[in-house]
Amino acid sequence: VPRWRQQWSGPGTTKRFPETVLARCVKYTEIHPEMRHVDCQSVWDAFKGAFISKHPCNITEEDYQPLMKLGTQTVPCNKILLWSRIKDLAHQFTQVQRDMFTLEDTLLGYLADDLTWCGEFNTSKINYQSCPDWRKDCSNNPVSVFWKTVSRRFAEAACDVVHVMLNGSRSKIFDKNSTFGSVEVHNLQPEKVQTLEAWVIHGGREDSRDLCQDPTIKELESIISKRNIQFSCKNIYRPDKFLQCVKNPEDSSCTSEI
């Protein structure tokens, strides 16, 4: 008789999840010399240990601490790029602008990017059928807690001028419920971070509005100012240039000093 299995509202664990994590770890440590000391099998064991045999609605940041310790990494604290609802463009940017880093350019972010995972209480099985949805089921699920943990640490590490890329095409350019709005904004350290500079990416060159005047940007400015961090905002009208440079990163026109 097949065991009863909890049916969650979200998609199940990404197929070949263990192999994917391990392969990504090996690839990352090969490309990044400063992380060559990392033992990828230990990383996978720590990752697995965070959610296997645990109820997928009862995961804590503490569960991820062994993984966090193994994935400890130093990135230049003044070269951090946060993003909200515009991941692809942010990643394309750091692929060409090699001296800036998103969370997904770090080992832990790279391992988990675009993956879903969860286990089951009291069994060593990975659940490939369904995983908890943040809204419909529970917020303390393995994926959400992971991103909350790594995002908090990433924001805490930032210093000087921190940039955030925001999607000017969305109704809420700044969304308090996004990871950026709910975690990263509140974990920037005022004693280290001088300014948060928002880059609001316009949908196209023809859109000449000042999106830095958007009410949600004013809300972000208010939150940041109350935390004694300066805020500035720039309209960015040229996503076409981003894409051109992603296709031809070797072009000399694709170097921009911010």
Epitope: R205, C233, I236, Y237, R238, K241, D251, S253, C254, I258
Partner: antibody, heavy 121, light 105 residues
Framework: QVQLVESGGGLVQPGGSLRLSCAAS????????MNWVRQAPGKGLEWVSG????????YYADSVKGRFTISRDNSKNTLYLQMNSLRAEDTAVYYC??????????????WGQGTLVTVSS | DIELTQPPSVSVAPGQTARISCSGD??????VSWYQQKPGQAPVLVIY???NRPSGIPERFSGSNSGNTATLTISGTQAEDEADYYC????????FGGGTKVEIK
């Protein structure tokens, strides 16, 4: 080193046409968006037109829309500005300028020496 | 489109500091560049992205931009700094200020 050399300017009657050229050298021409900027005698700078690196997108100031056409030939490293229905107010030195600042910001790092267009009867 | 307004002229004694303003509605929300133009010559980029200096431009040139005003500062002005200066921004189209003539007294 980067060089931009404009040619094709001259005296033309109102309603007439002129084609300006800009020969580029010292850089990979096909990697850069290019622009035309003009300056009327004793006046300030005015952006006229721009074209993307491969020529797929073109942009115009309202004052020249429908009358001027920007184009480029990457095989010849040359930028063009076809000016039709010329008016007295089009009289200016026309500069060819290379657009830099690929991601966040846009500016003109290199300029040609300019070619004078005079529209007069 | 954003409108950029510059004072027609700024007069400064040699060795003193010249400040050229470029005002526009929330200009701080846009990146600003500055160009120097001497009589009969093409413009030369002196500042881009608000405050960055291209290679070859002396350190006495600096820029800032916040609120409704961008500023080009020339510290310890020299005779060769006498020229017209233009601010420029971009909001889907390129916009130039009207230009400021810097005179060295």
């Amino acid at each position: 080193q980067v060089q931009l050399v404009e040619s094709g300017g001259g005296l033309v009657q109102p309603g007439g046409s002129l084609r300006l050229s800009c020969a580029a050298s010292g850089f990979t021409f096909s990697s850069y968006a290019m622009n035309w900027v003009r300056q009327a005698p004793g006046k300030g700078l005015e952006w006229v037109s721009g074209i993307s690196s491969w020529g797929s997108s073109t942009y115009y100031a309202d004052s020249v829309k429908g009358r001027f056409t920007i184009s480029r030939d990457n095989s010849k490293n040359t930028l063009y500005l076809q000016m039709n229905s010329l008016r007295a107010e089009d009289t200016a030195v026309y500069y060819c300028a290379r657009e830099d600042g690929s991601y966040m910001t846009d500016y003109f790092a290199y300029w040609g020496q300019g070619t004078l267009v005079t529209v007069s009867s | 489109d954003i409108e950029l307004t510059q004072p027609p002229s700024v007069s400064v004694a040699p060795g003193q500091t010249a400040r050229i303003s470029c005002s526009g509605d929330n200009i701080g929300h846009y990146y600003v560049s500055w160009y120097q133009q001497k009589p009969g010559q093409a413009p030369v980029l002196v500042i881009y992205s608000d405050s960055n200096r291209p290679s070859g431009i002396p350190e006495r040139f600096s820029g800032s931009n916040s609120g409704n005003t961008a500023t080009l500062t020339i510290s310890g002005t020299q005779a060769e700094d006498e020229a017209d200066y233009y601010c420029q921004s971009y909001n889907g189209t390129y916009v130039f200020g009207g230009g400021t003539k810097v005179e060295i007294k």
